[in-house]
């Protein structure tokens, strides 16, 4: 890949092994765990990153209330099955033949079942709400400065088209970033909001996926923005299917 050409590394994904074994001796970077060649000029899909991770070691209230159908990733890490495009397979199973259906960001959207469980399609997560709490500061950040800085971050660092950053809400100390991307809106070459959100989440945790870059240094008008808590809600184009038992628990 041209992005990796000079010294055969992958700027956008440190969870790769790069080798001059591509066509014509060109540099080629393969994701750990899956062995799939990745495009180092853009973000790597969350599925391949998770697989690699498992193989390596204003006064008005503006905050959004997540809908009743919003999913939070409570299951944590697992070794996912990715399709040949690097996307999550709709059905995921563990080593003990327990299976479940996931959405396009790999979050479980059904009760767990056995090998007979059917997941007919990969349901797209079209709305992601990133809920952040920042550490105490001398005063509140200016909302429009904060908005501009976060939009710039998603555009420049994660290469996400600005139209997919739907809104930035702020009510000190809570910041909410809304990402929206319908199937029909996503063109070839567009970064997926799920991938951008995952890179952002890892950056916030101090676990940057970028090769050799310093960690995320978020500043608003020179003032450091330090995040102490992150919650991410995922909304799918089709609501999840959980049993009443779980919903009432």
């Amino acid at each position: 890949h041209t992005a990796a050409q000079d010294n055969c590394t992958c700027p956008t994904n440190k969870m790769t092994v790069c080798s001059p074994d591509g066509p014509g001796g060109r540099c080629q970077c393969r994701a750990l765990g899956s062995g799939m060649a990745v495009d180092c000029s853009t973000l790597t899909s969350k599925c391949l990153l998770l697989k690699a991770r498992m193989s390596a070691p204003k006064n008005a209230r503006t905050l959004v209330r997540p809908s009743e159908h919003a999913l939070v990733d409570n299951d944590g890490l697992y070794d996912p099955d990715c399709d040949p495009e690097g996307r999550f397979k709709a059905r995921q199973c563990n080593q003990t033949s327990v299976c479940w259906c996931v959405n396009s960001v790999g979050v479980r959207r059904t009760d767990k079942g056995d090998l007979s469980l059917r997941c007919d399609e990969l349901v797209r997560t079209h709305h992601i709400l990133i809920d952040l709490r920042h550490r105490p500061t001398a005063g509140a950040f200016n909302h429009s400065d904060l908005d501009a800085e976060l939009r710039r971050l998603f555009r420049e660092r994660y290469r996400l088209h600005p139209k997919f950053v739907a809104a930035v809400h702020y009510e000190q100390p809570t910041i909410q970033i809304e990402l929206r991307q319908n199937t029909s809106q996503k063109a070839a070459g567009d970064v997926d909001i799920g991938d951008a959100a995952y890179y952002f989440e890892r950056d916030i945790k101090g676990e940057s996926l970028f090769q050799g870059r310093g960690g995320l240094d978020l500043r608003v008008r020179g003032e450091p923005l330090q995040v102490e808590r992150t919650l991410i809600y995922y909304l799918d184009e089709i609501p999840p299917k959980f049993s009443m038992k779980r919903l009432t628990a």
């Epitope: 092994v17 080798s19 074994d21 591509g22 066509p23 799939m36 060649a37 495009d39 390596a56 040949p84």
Partner: antibody, heavy 116, light 113 residues
């Protein structure tokens, strides 16, 4: 020129282990994936796994996991494939190969015979 | 795992004839990131290691005669020998190196009538 030279034939008893070596020359050993492939008598080819010697990343085919160990010694540019708890169906020719889109380099093969 | 299925299992042709053999994969081998198909064709003669003929579905390895050509994309691939020679008698394997574990087809045996 690129060369992969494998160790000689082995005859082993069931339950024993065998370690096949593959010495690489003519290229930078640490920056290419090196894979191992099994070919049982009269049968097709089966990918066992691979290693990236520069960082010792290793991948195994689930079918062989637990019984096979792939290692590399960068000081001698040699890769190894060790197979344990041998059984008759492990009788095969084992090849090492430099992997990659245009890496058509294979060792000559090592015949491992498992017989009581 | 990706399953590679080759057809036919064997074929016998006269020298000079054109031959095609097929390889079908259970999943696409096209990498959307670089638009490369991760499929290779190998020729294996008795007592020898496989010899790489084609990589990337259609790129001929250097030193391979131009009578050998590869085509196809996604899940369906073809190896063509435009004019078979006596030295082409061998078993031909297709291989996916798109995603672990890499897998091979069962092989197509080519004989001369």
């Amino acid at each position: 020129q690129v060369q992969l030279v494998q160790s000689g034939p082995e005859v082993k008893k069931p339950g024993a282990s065998v370690k096949v070596s593959c010495k690489a020359s003519g290229y930078t050993f640490t920056i290419y994936w090196l894979g191992w492939v099994k070919q049982a008598p009269g049968q097709g080819l089966e990918w066992i796994g691979n290693i990236f010697p520069g960082s010792a990343y290793i991948n195994y085919n689930e079918k062989f996991k637990g019984r096979v160990t792939i290692t590399a010694d960068t000081s001698t540019s040699t890769a190894y494939m060790e197979l344990s708890s041998l059984r008759s169906e492990d009788t095969a020719v084992y090849f090492c190969a430099r992997e990659g889109s245009n890496s058509g380099y294979w060792g000559q093969g090592t015949l491992v015979t498992v017989s009581s | 795992d990706i399953v590679m299925t080759q057809s036919p299992d064997s074929l016998a042709v006269s020298a000079g004839e054109r031959v095609t053999m097929n390889c079908k994969s259970s999943q696409s081998l096209l990498n959307s990131g670089n638009q490369q198909n991760y499929l290779a064709w190998y020729q294996q003669k008795p007592g020898q290691p496989p010899k790489l003929l084609i990589y990337g579905a259609s790129t001929r390895e250097s030193g391979v005669p131009d009578r050998f050509s590869g085509s196809g994309s996604g899940t369906d691939f073809t190896l063509t020998i435009s004019s078979v020679q006596a030295e082409d008698v061998a078993v031909y394997y297709c291989q996916s190196d798109h995603i672990y574990p890499y897998t091979f087809g069962q092989g197509t045996k080519l004989e001369i009538k």
